[in-house]
């Protein structure tokens, strides 16, 4: 990488190296030959997360409840607020700027992976021998009832949306 004129945590201004402001502080005035860089702490609801020469701190992210957001981790002078979604919702992006309702798996499909605050429900088709007869964000595919173990016989075959129907065995007269 190219040579730099200053030490780490310094910047070049007016042919002189000045100290950067530490995280959580903003630049008020550059250093001179006789004075150090002047920095001020960020205000309430503001932050700067790197060594910097910014004259303004960044505003903390607002977790808008109208968008289904809530605070997961409160911001500090050195870190931004982290938002997540209300129960039953998940973020639409990595930045979590808005939320959408968790997807439900339709009949014939079961939940492979339950949704989190940052990922949607993952559905999978119910394979042969399994069914789901509800639209749900939690229900997995259920196995068909085993008629034999109940000493019954299959009267109606199961599908991916319905269970088998068991009935009594025909008696010989």
């Amino acid at each position: 990488e190219p040579p730099t004129a200053c030490r780490e945590k310094q910047y070049l201004i007016n042919s002189q190296c000045c100290s950067l402001c530490q995280p959580g502080q903003k630049l008020v005035s550059d250093c001179t030959e006789f004075t150090e860089t002047e920095c001020l702490p960020c205000g309430e609801s503001e932050f700067l997360d790197t060594w910097n020469r910014e004259t303004h701190c960044h505003q903390h992210k607002y977790c808008d409840p109208n968008l289904g957001l809530r605070v997961q981790q409160k911001g500090t002078s050195e870190t931004d607020t982290i938002c997540t979604c209300e129960e039953g919702w998940h973020c639409t992006s990595e930045a979590c700027e808005s939320c959408v309702l968790h997807r439900s798996c339709s009949p014939g499909f079961g939940v492979k992976q339950i949704a989190t605050g940052v990922s949607d429900t993952i559905c999978e088709p119910c394979p042969v021998g399994f069914f789901s007869n509800v639209s749900s964000a939690f229900e997995k595919c259920h196995p068909w009832t085993s008629c034999e173990t109940k000493d019954l016989v299959v009267q109606q075959a199961g599908t991916n949306k319905t269970d088998v129907v068991c009935g009594p065995q025909d008696r010989l007269r």
């Epitope: 040579p3 730099t4 004129a5 200053c6 030490r7 780490e8 310094q10 070049l12 042919s15 002189q16 190296c17 000045c18 100290s19 250093c31 001179t32 030959e33 004075t35 150090e36 860089t37």
Partner: antibody, heavy 126, light 107 residues
Framework: QVQLVQSGAEVKKPGASVKVSCKAS????????MHWVREAPGQGLEWMGW????????NYAQKFQGRVTMTRDTSISTAYMELNRLRSDDTAVYYC???????????????????WGQGTLVTVSS | DIQMTQSPSSVSASVGDRVTITCRAS??????LAWYQKKPGKAPNLLIY???TLQSGVPSRFSGSGSGTDFTLTISSLQPEDFATYYC?????????FGGGTKVEIK
């Protein structure tokens, strides 16, 4: 007491590489930048670059960019300077030199060298 | 890069003489300047930093002055052990640069 002890003299052929070590003792190795300075026969002092032993960050003089690599091993408080593609005009005494403490400097780079290694003579000859 | 020009390149003097060496920077470097003494086969020895601050353990006959572009190293009364080469070095920005050196020889 502070000491910087360098590796011994080296004789190299043109095109080869050399790696010089500088073992620090008597102070907190990660608290001070380490610089490398060379003195060629009949020439003055020439700054080559620095390494921050704490972060591993480096800064090389433009002249040596692409040919020099400065590294460190904090577990043994040792800095290294490797120079590649050696030429006859790289024949010189190479010194490591300790800078002022990290955080000491607020304006300027304030790189003054209060402790030096004993020097390592590198001779490049075919 | 900042060029550092030292003068004279050599000076012949006797024990007890007052010796003055000057160093000029190609651009303003505030007070970010150091002076070193260098003897053959030895590592340099820091004498003065921030233009005028005497390094611990250095005799008070050495003094430095100047700021901006013009700097001076003065040896008020030359001693036998002072015969050496003296270098200035700017510490304002990287790359660090040294003057060409001034050799102080016995007259």
């Amino acid at each position: 007491q502070v000491q910087l002890v360098q590796s011994g003299a080296e004789v190299k052929k043109p095109g080869a590489s050399v790696k010089v070590s500088c073992k620090a003792s008597g102070y907190t190795f990660t608290g001070y930048y380490m610089h490398w300075v060379r003195e060629a026969p009949g020439q003055g002092l020439e700054w080559m670059g620095w390494i921050n032993p704490d972060s591993g960050g480096t800064n090389y003089a433009q002249k040596f960019q692409g040919r020099v690599t400065m590294t460190r091993d904090t577990s043994i408080s040792t800095a290294y300077m490797e120079l590649n593609r050696l030429r006859s005009d790289d024949t010189a005494v190479y010194y490591c030199a300790r800078d002022q403490p990290l955080g000491y400097c607020t304006n300027g780079v304030c790189s003054y060298f209060d402790y030096w290694g004993q020097g390592t003579l590198v001779t490049v000859s075919s | 890069d900042i060029q550092m020009t030292q003068s004279p390149s050599s000076v012949s003097a006797s024990v007890g003489d007052r010796v003055t060496i000057t160093c000029r920077a190609s651009q303003g470097i505030y007070s970010w300047l150091a002076w070193y003494q260098k003897k053959p086969g030895k590592a340099p020895n820091l004498l003065i930093y921030t233009a005028s601050t005497l390094q611990s353990g250095v005799p008070s006959r050495f003094s430095g002055s100047g700021s901006g572009t013009d700097f001076t190293l003065t040896i008020s009364s030359l001693q036998p052990e002072d015969f050496a080469t003296y270098y200035c070095q700017q510490a304002n920005i990287f790359p660090l640069t040294f003057g060409g050196g001034t050799k102080v020889e016995i007259k």
